[in-house]
């Protein structure tokens, strides 16, 4: 019997994520696979030999080699989650404990910027815990949470790059900034 | 539960490249930078830079921007870093660590110790 | 690149004493997370994102700060507190790390 630490899963809001079983293959042996959201002591879903596969609701889906697919996560599916695999002899072959954590996708960051104080902004609006990084002709400036301010004074031309991202996505906008000798918008 | 291996130690000749690797379980690979961080015997920590296993983007510090390659590979959810054209300075317990801006570098590997000696 | 100047280098204290080090930054930073390393061992996070104790980071700890002065505390010293506290900022690229606290045990 193997019990190991939670396996930490990160997963976005609004996707699907699939818990696949580590270091496990599916055989004739096997005989109920169950899967059990801890918080509530609930189970979610089971695979039994010769038996119509349980699924607690739609949004859960078993496949046969033990992966349970989670469909458009939801804050609420933030859990730990437990998978007992048994063989035909009833005896606990395998358990597997996920620490489930979703975040918001982070949204594509925008770039705004003026001539007159030759300064720039990057931001981005929508995400959970994002971090933004910000380049200036692929040579790394700054980073920070969800806003980054740059005055630059090395050339009116440049090709700025700005890279949002989290546990989950990530997501970056270039823009080519050119602005007139005398600094005007 | 969230593990970073690094092999034990390396010995190399002056002059030489190493590659040394990371090899990462119990989490999602994709979802942490990982990072380098140097410390010669009975001195403080120095990071030489991180890689996003997601995309591969890359940060530097200057001074090992020529030395060390940063690579990903995420069958085997392996980070790597070469270090070329060694010398004695280079001596030293090279790091993995992942780590986000608001977690900061959350697990460590056991370190490889390198040793650059004729 | 942001100088963390640690202070002091080394200390000394009798269990049950209140320690406090300091971790000072040549420009503003946001990010700040503090290291345990002892001898021969990995350095852990101890504190992160100013002042969130890593998990099974005792009670006694607490970190505070902000712009360019930042804090570790320990409550009341005991003996396998005896380590070296690195800080690290993570607001500016590079990533720097203090050169180290010291503490000692009398």
């Known amino acids: 019997k193997e019990i190991t630490n939670a396996l930490e899963t990160w997963g976005a809001l609004g996707q699907d994520i699939n818990l696949d079983i580590p270091s496990f293959q599916m055989s004739d042996d096997i005989d109920d696979i169950k899967w059990e959201k801890t918080s509530d002591k609930k189970k979610i879903a089971q695979f039994r030999k010769e038996k119509e596969t349980f699924k607690e609701k739609d949004t859960y889906k078993l496949f046969k080699n033990g992966t349970l697919k989670i469909k458009h996560l939801k804050t609420d599916d933030q859990d730990i989650y437990k998978v007992s695999i048994y063989d035909t002899k009833g005896k606990n072959v395998l358990e597997k404990i996920f620490d489930l954590k979703i975040q918001e996708r982070v949204s594509k960051p925008k770039i705004s910027w003026t001539c007159i104080n030759t300064t720039l902004t990057c931001e981005v609006m929508n995400g959970t815990d994002p971090e933004l990084n910000l380049y200036q002709d692929g040579k790394h400036l700054k980073l920070s949470q969800r806003v980054i301010t740059h005055k630059w004074t090395t050339s009116l031309s440049a090709k700025f790059k700005c890279t949002a991202g989290n546990k989950v996505s990530k997501e970056s906008s270039v823009e080519p900034v050119s602005c007139p000798e005398k600094g005007l918008d | 539960q969230v593990q970073l291996q690094q092999p034990g130690a390396e010995l190399v000749r002056p002059g030489a490249s190493v590659k040394l690797s990371c090899k990462a379980s119990?989490?999602?690979?994709?979802?942490?930078?990982m990072n380098w961080v140097k410390q010669r015997p009975e001195q403080g920590l120095e990071w030489i830079g991180r890689i996003d296993p997601h995309d591969s983007e890359t940060h530097y510090r200057q001074k090992f921007k020529d030395m060390a390659i940063l690579t990903v590979d995420k069958s085997s959810r392996t980070a790597y870093m070469q270090l070329s054209s060694l010398t004695s300075e280079d001596s030293a317990v090279y790091y993995c660590?992942?780590?986000?801006?608001?977690?900061?570098?959350?697990?460590w590997g056991q370190g490889t110790s390198v040793t650059v000696s004729s | 690149q942001i100088v963390l100047t640690q202070s002091p280098a080394i200390m000394s204290a009798s269990p049950g004493e209140k320690v406090t080090m300091t971790c000072r930054a040549s420009s503003s930073v946001s990010h700040m997370h503090w290291y345990q390393q002892k001898s021969g061992t990995s350095p852990k996070r101890w504190i992160y994102?100013?002042?969130k104790l890593a998990s099974g980071v005792p009670a006694r700890f607490s970190g505070s700060g902000s712009g360019t002065s930042y804090s570790l505390t320990i409550s009341s010293v005991e003996a396998e507190d005896a380590a070296t506290y690195y800080c690290?900022?993570?607001?500016?690229?590079?990533?720097?790390f203090g050169a180290g606290t010291k503490l000692e045990l009398k």
């Open positions: 994102d100013t002042s």
């Open positions: 660590a992942r780590g986000t801006m608001l977690d900061g570098m959350d697990y």
């Open positions: 119990g989490y999602t690979f994709t979802s942490y930078w």
């Open positions: 690290q900022q993570w607001s500016s690229n590079p990533l720097t």
